[in-house]
């Protein structure tokens, strides 16, 4: 029997029932490699509470349709006194990535999953050449899912201070160059997920091979390797490889763009701070609304409830389905059955069944998937109680006054599946807008101006045009809504600019589009503020002008006009200056544009060194000074000692010259023990220091790539700029 979804075959996938602390391993084409579940288990259930394993789906007992996959077992189970077999049922829906299997619910006998994936699409428009699983569960069964970062066309430009090369990457899948309008990517070879552009040439420096890995709490790693045998002439005989480390920010902040932290010998190290690396909780509710602080999610489906005897209708070929969700209005067809979903046979209206009751409902939100489940319907001939699973999709332009209408998509073993496009499923989620601008390879970053939470305060604009009595206060935040504190406490929740006077507060605009580079300055436009008459809404423009070293000055109100519909501010700030690389001496470096100063001398060890262990070697490194550890050379800044025979290599002479670019401090040690290659290249070490306010001194981590590249990454609070 041919595999129904070949794209999903190469991996064992995971799904979690968080409520019951159960981890499922799923292999839809073969068997999972778990001894306790037996040799032919396709779905293995690991109950972490009881520390037991059960096979709940056998690879041999598989049956499939276009959108449903069933795995039966030979294990009996008892449901309503009838004798059944335990089974797993996976409902497939078309998605834009390989996606993730999601646990829906489980009865005594059936374990239900839903999987939104390109593998289930009728057309191949979203299918990748190469794609790997893009999510992981941590030890606490919390999901970290990078699927939202996957680009369906185009790529992310990795931030790097080198003007001559550009590294483009995608997440977990290859770059689709055909559908990308940008000419730079056209030359990228097919299958590449990391494409290096040098002049008019493009090179494949990495393709996805393994899925996402969790290296430690809130830090995920994705590795790409170049599949082709031929070496690239600029890689000094090394095979290119790319490692992307996704870091969950230590507090709720906007994500950054990916940054190149090392690239010696074509071993490209990328760090990406993004909230998608943080775990996502599953939310569940027995009502039709739910909200979650951590996800910044708020959902209310109660407007979908029909009143006055009305109901929705959905066509199921042989049957009609009448639905009334989120309400307790009896569907007359299903008289006295308390049905939320009522199934009526088209050819015989006396054949009526409840396909789920309104007091047996669960609303579930996970990673953008919103599902409403109605249990406890009339029994089928098999003894199973009918149930309905409604998958909601956000559609801001849905008909029927935004409510949309449910569409029947299929049935398996008396479980009825519907999809429903509606504006009420549009989840208020975190912003995906960037707080910066680009102009070719020039980058501008306004994140230093963002105010996130107490004890920080909003920026208040200077307005010299008013007398004290008629004074208006203008509160501004950058790329973020204003903080509701102090005089801005009464400001509308989603206002990014807010005016406050004796009459109250006004929303002067929301952050709904990223900053733009215009005429040498940065323009930030906030729109969709309060109504200002004639069907118009207030709009605010902020022009940010580069002023090196100044992150303290406040914005100034320049004009307001169009009958109170338009406001213009000007802001002279270092945040509007182009990001540039700066060098420093004596273990310090000064970012003259932003006015930040960094001093890493507290990390220098007067005696000894920092030790980093790997399987075969011990590495000793110091910061801005020599390691004083025998058997290392006295002038080496880093040295490598073989555990087997204590053979030692100098990995570079110590120095105290730091370089700084966009939040990243680097220290390079060169001139170490030469390699045994033709050119006898001296060994070198690169240490990249990255900000982590909670890390204190922190410690170096060796980026284990190959035998001759010595990249260390060091998270430390000493790499954090002082908040201005």
């Amino acid at each position: 029997q041919a595999a129904p979804f070949p794209e999903l075959c190469s991996y064992t996938w995971e799904a979690v029932d968080t409520k019951n602390n159960v981890l499922y391993k799923i292999n839809i084409c073969g068997s999972v490699d778990i001894v306790q579940c037996g040799p032919s288990s396709a779905v293995c259930m690991h109950d972490l509470k009881t520390r037991t394993y059960h096979s709940v789906g056998d690879s041999v007992l598989r049956s499939a349709t276009r959108s449903l996959l069933e795995f039966n077992t030979t294990v009996s189970c008892d449901q309503q006194g009838t004798n059944h077999r335990v089974q797993s049922s996976i409902a497939f829906l078309c998605g834009k990535t390989l996606g993730t299997p999601e646990f829906v619910t489980a009865t005594e006998c059936v374990h239900y999953f839903e999987w939104r994936t390109t593998a289930a699409c009728k057309k191949d428009i979203f299918k990748a050449n190469k794609e790997v699983p893009c999510y992981v569960f941590d030890e606490e069964l919390r999901k970290h899912d990078l699927n939202p970062l996957i680009k369906l066309s185009g790529a992310y430009l990795v931030d790097d201070s080198d003007p001559d090369t550009s590294l483009f990457i995608n997440v977990c899948r290859d770059i689709d160059t055909l559908r990308d309008p940008g000419s730079q990517l056209r030359a990228c070879p097919p299958g590449t997920a990391a494409c290096l552009v040098r002049g008019h040439q493009a090179f494949d420096v990495g393709q996805p091979r393994d899925g996402l890995k969790l290296v430690r709490k809130d830090r995920l790693v994705l590795s790409y390797v170049r599949e082709e045998a031929g070496k690239l002439d600029f890689c000094d005989g090394h095979s290119p490889a790319v490692t992307i480390t996704f870091v969950c920010p230590s507090e709720r902040r906007e994500g950054t763009i990916p940054k190149l932290t090392a690239k010696s010998n074509c071993r490209y190290e990328i760090e990406w701070i993004t909230e998608y690396a943080c775990h996502r909780d599953y939310l569940e509710s027995k009502t039709c609304s739910l909200s979650g602080e951590q996800q910044d999610v708020s959902i209310d489906l109660t407007p979908l409830a029909q009143s006055g005897g009305s109901s929705y209708i959905s066509d199921g070929k042989e049957y009609l389905f009448y639905l009334n969700v989120c309400g307790e209005t009896e569907i007359q067809f299903c008289n006295k059955k308390q049905a939320a979903v009522c199934q009526v046979k088209k050819s015989d209206t006396s054949q009526v069944k409840a396909a789920g009751r309104y007091h047996n409902q669960t609303l579930r939100y996970s990673d953008g998937d919103l599902t409403l489940i109605y249990f406890g319907g009339d029994e089928c001939s098999s003894g199973f109680q009918r149930m309905s699973v409604i998958n909601f999709e956000c559609n801001k332009t849905a008909g029927n006054d935004g409510k949309g209408t449910p569409v029947f998509t299929g049935e398996v073993d008396c479980t009825y599946f519907f999809t429903w496009d509606t504006e009420y499923a549009c989840v208020k989620e975190k912003e995906d807008l960037l707080c910066g601008a680009t102009d070719g390879k020039k980058r501008y970053d306004l994140s230093a101006l963002v105010r996130h939470a107490e004890p920080e305060q909003n920026w208040e604009a200077v307005d010299g045009s008013q007398t004290e009595t008629e004074k208006k206060h203008f509160f501004i935040n950058i790329c973020h809504r204003v903080l509701q504190e102090g005089k801005a406490r009464g400001c509308p929740e989603d206002a990014a600019v807010c005016a406050v006077d004796k009459n109250g507060s006004k929303n002067l605009g929301k952050f709904i589009s990223s900053p733009m580079k215009e005429k040498g300055n940065i323009q930030l436009s906030y729109s969709d503020g309060d109504d200002c008459g004639h069907g118009k809404k207030i709009k605010t423009n902020i022009t940010l002008v580069c002023k090196p070293g100044d992150l303290e000055s406040a914005p100034v109100l320049r004009t307001s006009g169009e009958g109170g519909c338009f406001y213009e501010f000007e802001w002279h700030t270092a945040a509007a200056c182009v990001l540039s690389k700066t060098e420093g001496e004596n273990c310090t470096v000064f970012d003259s544009q932003a006015g930040f100063s960094f001093d890493l001398s507290p990390l220098t060890k007067k005696n000894g060194a920092y030790k980093v262990e790997t399987k075969k070697y011990d590495f000793y490194i110091n910061v801005c000074g020599p390691v004083s550890v025998s058997p290392c050379q006295p002038d080496s800044g880093a040295c490598q000692v073989a555990k087997s025979d204590e053979k030692t290599w100098n990995l570079g002479l110590s120095n105290a010259k730091l370089s700084y670019y966009d939040g990243m401090i680097q220290l390079n040690y060169r001139g170490g023990t030469p390699y045994n290659n033709e050119r006898h290249t001296p060994r070198a070490t690169l240490i990249t220091f990255l900000c982590d306010r909670d890390a204190g001194v922190g410690f170096p981590e060796y980026q284990e790539e190959d035998n001759s590249t010595y990249n260390f990454r060091w998270y430390t609070s000493y790499a954090c700029p002082e908040e201005p």
Partner: nanobody, 109 residues
Framework: EVQLVESGGGLVQAGGSLRLSCAAS?????MGWYRQAPGKQRELVAI???????IYADSVQGRFTISRDNAKNTVYLQMNSLKPEDTAVYYC??????WGQGTQVTVSS
């Protein structure tokens, strides 16, 4: 409760046309038509959801057209190319279970 008033039934020759109408006492969805021929079960003819496309029984597809006037809370069934096997009592149904009293349609050959 919802009051329904049906009209438009009658006797017609095969190949002829009839138009049924059903007025509800208030706004309600969906609105549609079912029928029951002597000795048979009641079956779907056509139904009009509050939004989206109408649903028709295979046997009437292309011959019958359902429409509604929201302002009048009324649903219509335009029946063309009638056949003897369309003979039945036609029932208006609204809201998923409220029934009209039925109107007889007889198609003679």
């Amino acid at each position: 409760e919802v009051q329904l008033v049906e009209s438009g039934g009658g006797l017609v020759q095969a190949g002829g046309s009839l138009r049924l109408s059903c007025a509800a006492s208030r706004s309600i969805s969906p609105m549609g038509w079912y029928r029951q021929a002597p000795g048979k079960q009641r079956e779907l003819v056509a139904i009009m959801p509050s939004s989206g496309t109408p649903i028709y029984a295979d046997s009437v597809q292309g011959r019958f057209t359902i429409s509604r006037d929201n302002a009048k809370n009324t649903v219509y069934l335009q029946m063309n190319s009638l056949k003897p096997e369309d003979t039945a009592v036609y029932y208006c149904n609204v809201g998923g279970g409220y029934w009209g009293q039925g109107t007889q349609v007889t198609v003679s050959s």
